[in-house]
Interface confidence: medium
């Protein structure tokens, strides 16, 4: 019979013959012959192959380097790579998450609109009138000014976006 020029899915052509590809999690040891099947071996510890393949070497799992702020989000298997993410307080510098940077803090006068995640930085917003923040934080929102009236006091010093109002006693001489 004519030697094949194309093979079925999950097969490959070698020496005018269709051989079975190795399944995910296994690597190729030897091609099939007229008389033998393709020989495959499982990937070793800390190795993987995620497709039907004819690779002679498995890929190494990604290393989540703690010195780069990385930690393991999902441990790799023989069929999947390790997924890294950033430690709390850090976020990935790229989609591949090869390293991390520290979340930005919101300076005094600004509050946290959205706390950072493993993939996105802190979002800060200016404290609007009636609110303040006197801290540099990646977590704290703007706080409302103290309501002197509810404490039966009066405003002695106006608040700013960085400072709370200062309350004082009522002037009893006034009507």
């Amino acid at each position: 019979p004519e030697p094949p020029t194309a093979c079925r899915e999950k097969q490959y052509l070698i020496n005018s013959q269709c051989c079975s590809l190795c399944q995910p999690g296994q690597k190729l040891v030897s091609d099939c012959t007229e008389f033998t099947e393709t020989e495959c071996l499982p990937c070793g510890e800390s190795e993987f192959l995620d497709t039907w393949n004819r690779e002679t070497h498995c890929h190494q799992h990604k290393y989540c380097d703690p010195n780069l702020g990385l930690r393991v989000q999902q441990k790799g298997t023989s069929e999947t790579d390790t997924i890294c993410t950033c430690e709390e307080g850090w976020h990935c510098t790229s989609e591949a998450c090869e390293s991390c940077v520290l979340h930005r803090s919101c300076s005094p006068g600004f509050g946290v609109k959205q706390i950072a995640t493993g993939v996105s930085d802190t979002i800060c917003e200016p404290c609007p009138v009636g609110f303040f923040s006197n801290v540099s934080s990646a977590f704290e929102k703007c706080h409302p000014w103290t309501s002197c009236e509810t404490k039966d006091l009066v405003v002695q010093q106006a608040g700013t976006n960085k400072t709370d109002v200062v309350c004082g006693p009522q002037d009893r001489l006034r009507a």
Epitope: G89, S105, S107, S136, F139, E140
Partner: nanobody
């Protein structure tokens, strides 16, 4: 000048407890998020826990969650780390760090560290 002085480390048996302190000076302590990091022998820095400026928000590494508690006393300019159910793998030099605004590791200001050894 920013100064951070850790204390409270020592030798403790597995399952035991320790409380670390960090006395801060040279900056407005109550205005900054603070954190603890550690370095085990022959290993890189590992983040342990973070506390927000007011103390309302706390965060922990998975490896210490449920065992360690971070807290602060802004009136005393002091950061604490209560460590319970200690394990051999908690052996490390522990540093407190003032959280920088943004950027790459390492952390901006940290103390000289205090050694915690967990061994029977």
């Amino acid at each position: 000048e920013v100064q951070l002085l850790e204390s409270g480390g020592g030798l403790v048996q597995p399952g035991g407890s320790l409380r670390l302190s960090c006395a801060a000076s040279g900056f407005t302590f109550s205005s900054y998020d603070m954190k603890w990091v550690r370095q085990a022998p022959g290993k890189g820095l590992e983040w342990v826990s973070t506390i927000s400026a007011s103390g309302v928000f706390t965060y922990y590494a998975d490896s210490v969650k449920g065992r360690f508690t971070i807290s602060r006393d802004n009136s005393k300019n002091t950061l604490y780390l209560q460590m319970n159910s200690l394990r051999a793998e908690d052996t490390a030099v522990y540093y407190c760090a003032k959280r920088e605004h943004a950027g790459q590791p390492p952390f901006d200001y940290w103390g000289q560290g205090t050694l915690v050894t967990v061994s029977s």
